[in-house]
Interface confidence: low
């Protein structure tokens, strides 16, 4: 069940880490907006998609709601079926 007051990406952190496959696309969408060059490289350096997503999530505590919306929008564009599935859960 959704937790009130939490952003979608925080509510579904574990599922996103496990199920997002197109991480590179997300990085390109977020680069220069909410990700610095160093952050972008740090995520890219991770060996697997789950570890890339885990690394990406290590930066999100410093993000405000609008920044998290950018990630959600990128997810909708890259893996809309996943977002829809999580919204139904």
């Amino acid at each position: 069940a959704a937790k009130p007051g939490l952003h979608f990406i925080d509510q579904h952190r574990a599922a996103l880490i496990a199920r997002v496959t197109n991480v590179e696309w997300l990085l390109d969408a977020l680069y220069g907006k909410v990700l610095t060059d160093e952050q972008y490289q740090a995520v890219r350096a991770e060996p697997t998609n789950p570890s890339k997503m885990r690394k990406l999530f290590s930066f999100t505590p410093a993000w405000n709601w609008t920044c998290k919306d950018l990630l959600l929008q990128a997810l909708r564009e890259s893996q809309s079926y996943l977002v829809e599935d999580l919204e139904r859960s």
């Epitope: 937790k3 007051g5 925080d10 740090a42 290590s58 505590p61 405000n64």
Partner: antibody, heavy 119, light 107 residues
Framework: QVQLKQSGPGLVQPSQSLSITCKVS????????VHWVRQSPGKGLEWLGV???????EYNEAFISRLTISKDNSKSQILFRMNSLQPADTAIYYC?????????????WGQGTTLTVSS | DIQMTQTSSSLSASLGDRVTISCRAS??????LNWYQQRPDGTVKLLIY???KVHSGVPSRFSGSGSGTDFSLTISNLEQEDFATYYC?????????FGGGTKLEIK
């Protein structure tokens, strides 16, 4: 400058609970996570848990059944509560801010709260 | 859990010396290795994060290196205030874990 100031009791009896307040300054709890670490004579430094900027929590599985971390962003305060204390919980308890980027590290620490569990 | 091992629990050195403190992880932690200094009064300070990045305000005589499972902290030109206990910590995998500490004592 960034500061974390802790307050809490020094002596607690077995089976009772511990409450520590960590009051932060010069940064916002709505933008930074805060971790809790303890240092006991027998086990060294142990990571206990974290409360993220959005309010979600993650706990070390060894403590998940008796640990609660909460916060009040408007008061810049985090509350750490641990139940069912035993002498083995005698330790120094620290709050520490999560650093930016590059995994999880702790860039500023509180002064520590020394806890003795004894009857 | 990932075990962090600091092989030396204590080291003796003199003012002006260069010392290296080692830390080993039980599995690959990439570069997510951090170093802290603890003074006798309990005060803890971050020195190095992500293996080699020096935290703001930390003197340049502190440096870190390594990757994977083997890491080291080097302090060059030791000063009086450097005699303290040093801990490594992995920030790669939950639960985050620490080494047992290395106490740097004056010779």
């Amino acid at each position: 400058q960034v500061q974390l100031k802790q307050s809490g009791p020094g002596l607690v009896q077995p089976s009772q609970s511990l409450s520590i307040t960590c009051k932060v300054s010069d940064f916002s709890l709505s933008h930074y996570g805060v971790h809790w670490v303890r240092q006991s004579p027998g086990k060294g430094l142990e990571w206990l848990g974290v409360i993220w900027s959005g309010g979600t929590t993650e706990y070390n599985e060894a403590f998940i059944s008796r640990l609660t971390i909460s916060k009040d962003n408007s008061k810049s305060q985090i509350l750490f509560r641990m139940n069912s204390l035993q002498p083995a919980d005698t330790a120094i308890y620290y709050c520490a801010r999560k650093g930016d980027f590059y995994g999880d590290y702790f860039d500023y620490w509180g002064q520590g709260t020394t806890l003795t569990v004894s009857s | 859990d990932i075990q962090m091992t600091q092989t030396s629990s204590s080291l003796s050195a003199s003012l002006g010396d260069r010392v290296t403190i080692s830390c080993r992880a039980s599995q690959d932690i990439s570069n997510y290795l951090n170093w802290y200094q603890q003074r006798p009064d309990g005060t803890v300070k971050l020195l190095i994060y992500y293996t080699s990045k020096v935290h703001s305000g930390v003197p340049s005589r502190f440096s870190g290196s390594g990757s994977g499972t083997d890491f080291s902290l080097t302090i060059s030109n030791l000063e009086q205030e450097d005699f303290a206990t040093y801990y490594c910590q992995q920030g790669n995998t939950r639960p985050f874990t620490f080494g047992g500490g290395t106490k740097l004592e004056i010779k």
